[in-house]
């Protein structure tokens, strides 16, 4: 039980960290290439991981202006790191009925980041709802 609890906590920490990185990037939205990117919204149940991978695959880019380029590039790179997998995530990977990334509405970086954050928050909420024990201790 303890190792599975630790795994769940690692997953939760990773999702929370991604939100912090998204919030950091939102401060630099004017230094991002104003390109429209697929931004899933109102993601149907069991397609969260598919939508998550769409956000990770999107070509968010620094406009290479000013002295924020390094922090932006590092933040983008960190957003693309694979999170610890969960049973739910493994199950969802087998779903073939989720929309393709291209089918999602494309949005500029500001809205793209807001929608990414909303999805991460939804995934944290689902993760918490599926947990039976009431502690976040590691």
């Amino acid at each position: 039980h303890k190792s599975s609890s630790q795994g769940q906590d690692r997953h939760m920490i990773r999702m929370r960290q991604l939100i912090d990185i998204v919030d950091q990037l939102k401060n630099y939205v004017n230094d991002l290439v104003p390109e429209f990117l697929p931004a899933p919204e109102d993601v149907e149940t069991n397609c969260e991981w598919s939508a998550f991978s769409c956000f990770q695959k999107a070509q968010l880019k620094s406009a290479n202006t000013g002295n924020n380029e390094r922090i932006i590039n590092v933040s983008i790179k960190k957003l693309k790191r694979k999170p610890p997998s969960t049973n739910a995530g493994r199950r969802q990977k087998h779903r073939l009925t989720c929309p393709s990334c291209d089918s999602y509405e494309k949005k500029p970086p500001k809205e793209f980041l807001e929608r990414f954050k909303s999805l991460l928050q939804k995934m944290i909420h689902q993760h918490l709802s599926s947990r039976t024990h009431g502690s976040e201790d590691s």
Partner: antibody
């Protein structure tokens, strides 16, 4: 058990810098990010920023940007918070706190920094 | 920035009393709210995370509720060790703490 042990009290002159350390034990250091929070005498808590202990990535409270630098040394499982251009308003107790799944789950004992001419 | 406002800033109560502390966010923070307890000269301790979930080892007399912008910390029957200052903290967007509520002995 998880422990965060901070460096001792410091007295600094206005305009100087201070570097506070926080040594972690009882868990895998690079698995958890670390926050820094401060508390002026008789006042509330103020979040300063956080550091990813695995790669030194930082996110700072805009209020402290340009004055605060957070670093880490994985060989000693220690994080550092340096605050420059000190002024009297920076007199406070500075805490490190571990980035738990959804909260700051373990805290250091605090380090009092007094800024006085 | 999200501002967090706690009320009251202080209150006097007796052992056995039911105590309620409120916290209001300047914008919707969903359930992204934590509560900490701090005693004089000590570091804060986590009590409740994600609005209503009790941190391990925290007595069940502590409970949290709310959503959106309005949140409550309740101590169902105040014990001598509960006299302390309580802080709410949002983690919807980075981190911000409330100003604190000091619970004193009546």
């Amino acid at each position: 058990q998880v422990q965060l042990v901070q460096s001792g009290a410091e007295v600094k002159k206005p305009g100087a810098s201070v570097k506070v350390s926080c040594k972690a034990s009882g868990y895998t250091f690079t698995d958890y990010w670390m926050h820094w929070v401060r508390q002026a005498p008789g006042q509330g808590l103020e979040w300063m920023g956080l550091i990813d202990t695995s790669d030194s990535y930082t996110i700072y409270n805009q209020k402290f940007k340009g004055r605060v630098t957070m670093t880490r040394d994985t060989s000693t499982s220690t994080v550092y918070m340096e605050l420059s251009s000190l002024r009297s308003e920076d007199t406070a107790v500075y805490y490190c706190a571990r980035y738990g799944p959804l909260a700051m789950d373990y805290w250091g004992q605090g380090t009092l920094v007094t800024v006085s001419s | 920035d999200i501002q967090m406002t706690q009320s009251p800033s202080s209150l006097s109560a007796s052992v056995g009393d039911r105590v309620t502390i409120t916290c209001r966010a300047s914008q919707d923070i969903s359930n992204y709210l934590n509560w900490y307890q701090q005693k004089p000269g000590k570091a804060p301790k986590l009590l409740i995370y994600y609005t209503s979930r009790l941190h391990s080892g925290v007595p069940s007399r502590f409970s949290g509720s709310g959503s959106g912008t309005d949140f409550t910390l309740t101590i169902s029957s105040l014990q001598p060790e509960d006299f302390a200052t309580y802080y709410c903290q949002q983690f919807h967007t980075l981190r911000t703490f409330g100003g604190g509520t000091k619970v004193e002995i009546k």
